[in-house]
């Protein structure tokens, strides 16, 4: 099974090396998840032509995937550490239902999909420790998530393929924006 950063022998600090700081651990963790997304995207792109599809904007309108915007304070312009950290955690919590949807969408990369989901949960915990302003973080309602999951799973095959592609692309983009922002903190 895929290992999380810190479980791999390569990540264990050598006798004379410095242990990872909290920021370095988070950085490494996000990069680990991004590598997992890359593997999942590879399988998705190989089995369908969704990655080159021009119809994705149509499908995207029906998905409410978390997205970074300038007001979130994570971009270089208008950067705000507290606002941004809240946005990252809130966004990751919102992505959880979509990551759950991905669990039965892969054949050869089933373990990878599970690893992405589990390490995202761990990442949220890391970031919650880092956040001072926890009051501003809203957790999605379990009932809302359950009905969204049912709705997504009831789509036809083409829409399910498109949804998978869009979730992976959006999650990758969200994590990359998060990574860039966290490196400024």
């Amino acid at each position: 099974a895929p290992v999380l950063p810190g479980e791999d022998s390569k990540d264990v600090a050598a006798p004379h090396s410095q242990p990872l700081t909290s920021s370095e651990r988070i950085d490494k963790h996000i990069r680990y998840i991004l590598d997992g997304i890359s593997a999942l995207r590879k399988e998705t792109c190989n089995r369908s032509n969704m990655c080159e599809s021009s119809k994705e904007a149509l499908a995207e309108n029906n998905l409410n995937l978390p997205k970074m915007a300038e007001k979130d304070g994570c971009f270089q312009s208008g950067f705000n550490e507290d606002t941004c950290l809240v946005k990252i955690i809130t966004g990751l919590l919102e992505f959880e239902v979509y990551l759950e949807y991905l669990q039965n969408r892969f054949e050869s990369s089933e373990e990878q999909a599970r690893a992405v989901q589990m390490s995202t949960k761990v990442l949220i915990q890391f970031l919650q420790k880092k956040a001072k302003n926890l009051d501003a973080i809203t957790t999605p309602e379990p009932t809302t998530n359950a009905s969204l999951l049912t709705k997504l799973q009831a789509q036809n095959q083409w829409l399910q393929d498109m949804t998978t592609h869009l979730i992976l692309r959006s999650f990758k983009e969200f994590l990359q924006s998060s990574l860039r922002a966290l490196r400024q903190m």
């Epitope: 370095e24 950085d27 490494k28 996000i30 990069r31 991004l34 590598d35 997304i37 890359s38 590879k42 990655c51 080159e52 997205k67 970074m68 915007a69 300038e70 994570c74 971009f75 270089q76 312009s77 692309r169 959006s170 990758k172 983009e173 969200f174 990359q176 924006s177 990574l179 860039r180 490196r183 400024q184």
Partner: antibody, heavy 123, light 107 residues
Framework: QVQLVESGGGLVQPGGSLRLSCAAS????????MTWVRQAPGKGLEWVSS????????AYADSVKGRFTISRDNAKNTLYLQMNSLKSEDTAVYYC????????????????WGQGTQVTVSS | DVVMTQSPSSLPTSLGDSVTITCQAS??????LSWYQQKPGQTPKLLIY???KLQTGVPSRFSGSGSGTSFTLTISGLEAEDLATYYC?????????FGQGTKVELK
């Protein structure tokens, strides 16, 4: 094959404006980060600005912040650099570059470069 | 801002020599460092990304190492076509920054 072709350079007076364009072909433009890098005569390389694929996230060097604006038109496969309030120190060859793609998801590295367009700011 | 200090600025050498160029970051940049080669009148070319990963098509005599704040580009057995200026680039945090460059030339 991948091609990046810059245009829009030229001679402009201090305080003037120019808009550089970079026409991309041979790859799915919308999937890649794009960056402008410049090189003043006889000097080293200077990172100017980057724009990310779908987020609209942009970043600028301190030397151009507030004067330059990077943008992209994914439908036209074109990258732009709007340069306002130009100064003599902006004189350089401006290169359009593509960030590494594929499995490489975080590492910044510019794998394709255009031939560059000359910008000269002089009175 | 992360400041990159590249050394030496000039490196007189002989063909066949092993050449080492270093880049020092003012703070940790993980492995977000790339190396470029630029010959006179030509556009820069990516050699190494992720501190140590060799870009496709680049000869294996080029290698990169380092992590955190200290990075090295090594050319094992310099060839005539390697005479050029070399730059490092930190891609860890804004604003990204190139090193000042190292000109590799014959003694």
């Amino acid at each position: 094959q991948v091609q990046l072709v810059e245009s829009g350079g030229g001679l402009v007076q201090p305080g003037g404006s120019l808009r550089l364009s970079c026409a991309a072909s041979g790859f799915t433009f919308s999937n890649y980060y794009m960056t402008w890098v410049r090189q003043a005569p006889g000097k080293g390389l200077e990172w100017v600005s980057s724009i990310y694929s779908f987020s609209g996230d942009t970043a600028y060097a301190d030397s151009v912040k507030g004067r330059f604006t990077i943008s992209r038109d994914n439908a036209k496969n074109t990258l732009y650099l709007q340069m306002n309030s130009l100064k003599s120190e902006d004189t350089a060859v401006y290169y359009c570059t593509r960030n590494l793609g594929g499995v490489v998801v975080t590492t910044n590295g510019y794998d394709y470069w255009g031939q560059g367009t000359q910008v000269t700011v002089s009175s | 801002d992360v400041v990159m200090t590249q050394s030496p600025s000039s490196l007189p050498t002989s063909l066949g020599d092993s050449v080492t160029i270093t880049c020092q970051a003012s703070q940790s940049i993980s492995d977000e460092l790339s190396w470029y080669q630029q010959k006179p009148g030509q556009t820069p070319k990516l050699l190494i990304y992720g501190a140590s990963k060799l870009q496709t098509g680049v000869p294996s005599r080029f290698s990169g190492s380092g992590s955190g704040t200290s990075f090295t580009l090594t050319i094992s057995g310099l060839e005539a076509e390697d005479l050029a200026t070399y730059y490092c680039l930190q891609g860890y945090s804004w604003p990204f920054m190139f090193g000042q460059g190292t000109k590799v030339e014959l003694k």
